[in-house]
Amino acid sequence: ARNGDRCPLGPGRCCRLHTVHASLEDLGWADWVLSPREVQVTMCIGACPSQFREANMHAQIKMNLHRLKPDTVPAPCCVPASYNPMVLIQKTDTGVSLQTYDDLLAKDCHCV
Amino acid sequence: ARNGDRCPLGPGRCCRLHTVHASLEDLGWADWVLSPREVQVTMCIGACPSQFREANMHAQIKMNLHRLKPDTVPAPCCVPASYNPMVLIQKTDTGVSLQTYDDLLAKDCHCV
């Protein structure tokens, strides 16, 4: 693994993709989504220590300033670098519709 | 302002653009950047309460699951939605070069 992918805090502690099993009720979708009934939600969770999966120059700056002024500047944060697509069947006034979402499930993660 | 831009925590507490004055030393750039000597670093700082500047459907899901499982799922986090370009004059082996960076200064912010 590249240096930027090795977590100095221990395995699984740094920014990475997690899967959370959720029902429509959990997601607050029960009143407008019919299908799927349950979703394996992939999201980005974990710490962003120095040089770990830095997305860009801005993330490097943010980390440097965070070390200098931790009360003012937060550490970079773990967010999706890209997404996986997903289809929902939704309730409409006239029946049902098929909707595609390209920004719903995280595919991979980085620190910004 | 749209509902998603009104901070329920009070003015200035939610995710927004901040400017942090930094020297090359602060940024860790003193050994490879000649100019500018100082940078007005714009970055995204602040809380992401429910429905505030949600970047996409993923952010909505994350907030709903955070409320349900706060120990497992963190709240959405304040990150750049876009960037402003910046030019640096850098030291090189042969002298100096002008480099434009498109991912250095945050332009506006949202919650992901």
Partner: antibody, heavy 118, light 107 residues
Framework: QVQLQQSGPELVKPGASVKLSCKAS????????INWVKQRPGQGLEWIGW????????KYNEKFEGKATLTVDTSSSTAYMELHSLTSEDSAVYFC???????????WGQGTTLTVSS | DIVLTQSPATLSVTPGDRVSLSCRAS??????LHWYQQKSHESPRLLIK???QSISGIPSRFSGSGSGTDFTLSINSVETEDFGMYFC?????????FGGGTKLEIK
Amino acid sequence: QVQLQQSGPELVKPGASVKLSCKASGYTFTSYDINWVKQRPGQGLEWIGWIYPRDGISKYNEKFEGKATLTVDTSSSTAYMELHSLTSEDSAVYFCAGTSDPAYFDYWGQGTTLTVSS
Amino acid sequence: DIVLTQSPATLSVTPGDRVSLSCRASQSISYYLHWYQQKSHESPRLLIKYASQSISGIPSRFSGSGSGTDFTLSINSVETEDFGMYFCQQSNSWPYTFGGGTKLEIK
């Protein structure tokens, strides 16, 4: 494991109707959607429609509106497709397919062969 | 309706060959394309979802790529059990549509 057991082959006369069944087992019936797909001999696949087992909401391919009626019986974990005013063009293999994600078809029945002939 | 065109209609290959099957959509469908295998007198079987995502239980020699209008199913070393029909299906909009299929046969 998830299984979809379809009814046996049918030989019916032109103009008649027929009701095909698809019995689900190995999962909670209302957890997955049911789709129906037509395949004529040596040809491709055609999506007929989708049904939501929890309350019977359905959506049809416009081409099959009036030709097919989709229903479910949650008490017996069975989905049905009735085909009306049959012609030789309706002779085909009909598959039911269960979907955990509404985008694709992950579980298929074995198919029911329908022959329309006088 | 979205039309999916598969090519070639028939592909004759030798076990061990690497093959690529094409599926072209009449308009952009992002990543909303799925691949199935169907052997003679059997039901279709899902191989790849959302253009490139693998399916549990499907051999790793099957892979998918593409987005927008052009998609490819690759089999990196064909085995005898892989011969049959291959169909693509789109879920970008209703009605769902399938390609006409590619027949993979032994040379």
